[in-house]
């Protein structure tokens, strides 16, 4: 039975040209995290594997940095980066947990972080 929950940074906003950290946290389970996949809509951005370490998709290498922790840092943001991001936690023995973050990249300097929220 899957008892864990994914806590994410929720809906967040950032300035064009700036950077943002995408963070998810798995709690309420003793399952072992074996791999975390980060996706942007229909693109695989990066993978963090407990044994193999990080793999950043080559097409994103210039603008995506691993970490902190299992999170992902997006740099040199453009308006096209606006959209949904997903952290997919592969765990044993529970299975797969998915968290969602919505990022809005703003032209103006008024960029506020949204509240944290949980996805069961």
């Amino acid at each position: 039975m899957m008892t864990g929950t994914i806590e994410t940074t929720g809906n967040i906003s950032a300035e064009k040209g700036g950077s943002i950290i995408l963070q998810c946290h798995l709690s309420s389970t003793t399952a072992q995290v074996t791999q975390v996949n980060w996706e942007q809509q229909d693109q695989l951005l990066a993978i963090c594997n407990a044994d193999l370490g990080w793999h950043i998709s080559p097409s994103f290498k210039d603008r995506v940095a691993p970490g902190p922790g299992l999170g992902l840092t997006l740099q040199s943001l453009t308006v096209n980066d606006t959209g949904e991001y997903f952290c997919i936690y592969h765990t044993y023995p529970d299975g797969t947990y998915t968290g969602r973050i919505f990022l809005e990249v703003l032209e103006s300097s008024v960029a506020e972080h949204g509240a944290r929220f949980q996805i069961p």
């Epitope: 072992q32 791999q35 695989l44 993978i47 594997n49 193999l52 998709s57 592969h90």
Partner: antibody
Framework: EVQLLESGGGLVQPGGSLRLSCAAS????????MNWVRQAPGKGLEWVAG????????YYADSVKGRFTISRDNSKNTLYLQMNSLRAEDTAVYYC???????????WGQGTLVTVSS | DIQMTQSPSSLSASVGDRVTITCRAS??????LNWYQQKPGKAPKLLIY???SLQSGVPSRFSGSGSGTDFTLTISSLQPEDFATYYC?????????FGGGTKVEIK
């Protein structure tokens, strides 16, 4: 240098059994998912089974479920495929393939031929 | 199960031609799509992984694109050693599935 070497293929009668082995070298075997993929004569590629690096979770194609068993011995750097209740349609070259991140298969063995015939 | 449909099943081309092979998934697979090359009597060789990432050691004339359900493998300038059969494969979910293959022959 990464190497995968399959063995154990041969001629077997319908209903018989075979165990294929894949000896791995040149990388940390225990850190990678592994797969068996087969190719019938003149046909395309068909994934048969896979095993995760960490949990040892096993996955099978419907066509072999209940008849084939994938396993690994990390201490021997070896992947296995136990094949029971073999049928004529199992005749194929069987490849083992390394699966980093369980997303792609970057290294393949040379294959071993299994022929099921009376 | 996710079905992978490749087209064309075969094509004839000349050295220097630009060749495009398409692969369609029966449901969205994000970018969990890989391309392999196989020559007669040989094991498959990984060309492109995660839809668009070029495997180390593979010539840059090979490129991949697409996401969701529609994907493309392009060979920008066909070379004599590129005559082979090409397969797409999804790794979005098990069972992993391959396309039926595209045989690239000399015109």
């Amino acid at each position: 240098e990464v190497q995968l070497l399959e063995s154990g293929g041969g001629l077997v009668q319908p209903g018989g059994s075979l165990r294929l082995s894949c000896a791995a070298s040149g990388f940390t075997f225990s850190s990678y998912g592994m797969n068996w993929v087969r190719q019938a004569p003149g046909k395309g590629l068909e994934w048969v089974a896979g095993i995760k690096y960490s949990s040892g979770n096993k996955y099978y194609a419907d066509s072999v479920k209940g008849r084939f068993t994938i396993s690994r011995d990390n201490s021997k750097n070896t992947l296995y495929l136990q094949m029971n209740s073999l049928r004529a349609e199992d005749t194929a070259v069987y490849y083992c393939a390394r699966g980093p991140y369980d997303v792609w298969m970057d290294y393949w063995g040379q294959g071993t031929l299994v022929t099921v015939s009376s | 199960d996710i079905q992978m449909t490749q087209s064309p099943s075969s094509l004839s081309a000349s050295v220097g031609d630009r060749v495009t092979i398409t692969c369609r998934a029966s449901q969205s697979i994000s970018s969990y799509l890989n391309w392999y090359q196989q020559k007669p009597g040989k094991a498959p060789k990984l060309l492109i992984y995660a839809a668009s990432s070029l495997q180390s050691g593979v010539p840059s004339r090979f490129s991949g694109s697409g996401s969701g359900t529609d994907f493309t493998l392009t060979i920008s300038s066909l070379q004599p050693e590129d005559f082979a059969t090409y397969y797409c494969q999804q790794s979005y979910s098990t069972p992993l599935t391959f396309g039926g293959g595209t045989k690239v022959e000399i015109k």
